[in-house]
């Protein structure tokens, strides 16, 4: 079960999260990500005692990494051996010596530029750190990299707004607004994303209008990430919004706290997102947000955490 | 800074074909759709068409169709639009505008046309 | 394709007054497509609202708009010496674009 990736590929785990000792040129360790493109395209660098470190933001179960390397021109630049760091604070850290006391664990990379090599961790790592460092390389320590695993209470994953595990059609609204060349459709709701209408935006700007997700089964969902969104000179989010739920799609009940009606506060502006938690979560198929108030426009893109109901048994 | 800088004044005679340009900076023209707005002397605003570089799809007014087209050149992010067969009456000042979000927020600072024999 | 009509033609009043600039639409649209402009002599038009009553970055609030379906209104609640300007209204979308005939509005 706890195999998801964390966010390389997906840009869950942002550019600010990664780190290196040093880089190559323009190849900046915010590039490490699996399966990048483009003609610079990984993390690089030509010292030897290098190591590139990546922040998870919080404890998290690592139960594995991919890794990759890259070409640049006809050469092939990778990583064929490396070992693992790992720490809860950033300050005390521990070399991963899998189930030995002794040694440490020397894992085997990539013997090509494009191929992934799979490493389990068995036993897993818990930590908010993983740093790794290459022991062997061919002509440059070259890596993409995901690194696989879940959250440590295994309940505050992304459903999969971002990564489109949650498919369009799961995704509707009471209204949406479109333009001359333009739809701001339920769908666009997802963190992150990019493009020309890259959020959902309802035909009027009004306290009833709601974006709804259906999981399709029951969820445990813990939280919400909220996002805004930019035109060119024109900010556009939710300052506040309400939580409503349902099993059947029928009758809704909004999210209380303390007794009354929970008024989540939203985005302060148009990219940083905002994570709010359910205390307590919610056991529901049907999630709908309701936007309360907003600067300029209703403009939103989101991610769910959670976990399905079932891994709670 | 956002800008659109449009292409200086000309003159032609009816029947001939004008082109105007419309340079966009400080965003990529594929990001946003390009419109286009006639303004003949002393009167008022009339829409010529609109132009997405991002698919090459135009939408024309009707009174425009088969006189106007509407290219654009990302590799510039220059927008053109051409009139053919003009008339005296094609004489205006045309403005190209940009949707920010919705309506037309940044505009060029105009190009007169004038037809005359 | 939708006509829109602006009252009156021309508004004669002085600066600190209130001024009351209507748009009618010869069939109803959703006001999020509602857009009013205005223009001086020899520059370009600058978007005032949209949305029938959002406000465009760096409006002052003495701009605001109002209405629904046929009938929308943009009103100035004390006029300065720069708002003397001709008025525009537009409504915009998915189709065809329209502009109102404008109105003038003039020092008294």
């Known amino acids: 079960k706890c195999q998801t990736p964390l966010g390389m590929a997906s840009g869950h785990i942002r550019d600010f999260q990664i780190t290196a000792s040093g880089q190559y040129g323009q190849w900046a360790p915010k590039l490490a990500r699996l399966h990048y493109s483009g003609s610079i395209n990984a993390w690089s660098t030509k010292e030897p005692f290098s190591w590139i470190k990546v922040d998870l933001l919080a404890p998290m179960i690592i139960h594995g990494i991919k890794t990759q390397g890259a070409r640049q021109k006809f050469s092939s630049l990778y990583i064929s051996q490396f070992i693992i760091m790992y720490s809860l604070d950033g300050k005390k850290w521990q070399t991963y010596r899998g189930n030995s006391t002794g040694t440490l664990m020397v894992f085997f990379g990539n013997v090509d530029s494009s191929g992934i090599k799979h490493n389990i961790f068995n036993p897993p790592i818990i930590a908010r750190y993983i740093h790794l460092h290459p022991t062997h390389y061919s002509i440059r320590s070259t890596l993409r990299m995901e690194l696989m695993g879940c959250d440590l209470n295994s309940c505050s994953m992304p459903l999969g707004m971002e990564s489109k595990a949650i498919s369009d059609a799961q995704i509707t609204a009471s209204s949406y607004f479109t333009n001359m060349f333009a739809t701001w459709s339920p769908s666009k709701a997802r963190l992150h994303l990019q493009g020309r209408s890259n959020a959902w935006r309802p035909q009027v700007n009004n306290p009833k209008e709601w974006l709804q997700v259906d999981f399709q089964k029951t969820m445990k969902v813990t939280g919400v990430t909220t996002q805004g969104v930019k035109s060119l000179l024109t900010s556009m989010y939710v300052k506040e919004f309400l939580i409503s739920s349902s099993q059947d799609g029928h009758q809704w009940t909004l999210f209380f706290q303390n007794g009354k009606v929970k008024v989540f506060q939203g985005n302060q502006d148009s990219f940083t997102p905002v994570v709010n938690s359910l205390d307590p979560p919610l056991l529901t198929r049907y999630l709908r947000i309701h936007p309360q108030s907003w600067v300029h426009q209703i403009a939103l893109r989101m991610e769910v955490l959670g976990c399905e109901a079932q891994d709670l048994y | 800074q956002v800008q659109l800088v449009q292409s200086g004044a000309e003159v032609k005679k009816p029947g001939a074909s004008v082109k105007v340009s419309c340079k966009v900076s400080g965003y990529t023209l594929t990001e946003l759709p390009v419109h286009w707005v006639g303004q003949a002397p002393g009167k008022g605003l009339e829409w010529v068409g609109s132009f997405d570089p991002e698919s090459g799809e135009s939408i024309y007014a009707r009174e425009f169709q088969g006189s106007v087209t509407m290219t654009a050149d990302t590799s510039t992010d220059i927008a053109y639009m051409e009139l053919s067969s003009l008339r005296s009456d094609d004489t205006a000042v045309y403005y190209c505008a940009v949707p920010d979000p919705d309506a037309f927020d940044i505009w060029g600072q105009g190009t007169m046309v004038t037809v005359s024999s | 394709e939708i006509a829109l009509t602006q009252s009156p033609g021309t508004l004669s009043l002085s600066p600190g007054e209130r001024a009351t600039l209507s748009c009618r639409a010869s069939q109803s649209f959703s006001s999020s497509y509602l857009a009013w402009y205005q223009q001086k002599p020899g520059q370009a038009p600058r978007l005032l609202i949209y949305?029938?009553?959002t406000r465009a970055t760096g409006i002052p609030d003495r701009f605001s708009g109002s209405g629904s379906g046929t009938d929308f209104t943009l009103t100035i609640s004390r006029l300065e010496p720069e708002d003397f300007a001709v008025y525009y209204c537009q409504k915009y979308g998915t189709s065809a674009i329209t502009f109102g005939q404008g109105t003038r509005l003039e020092i008294k």
């Open positions: 949305g029938a009553s």
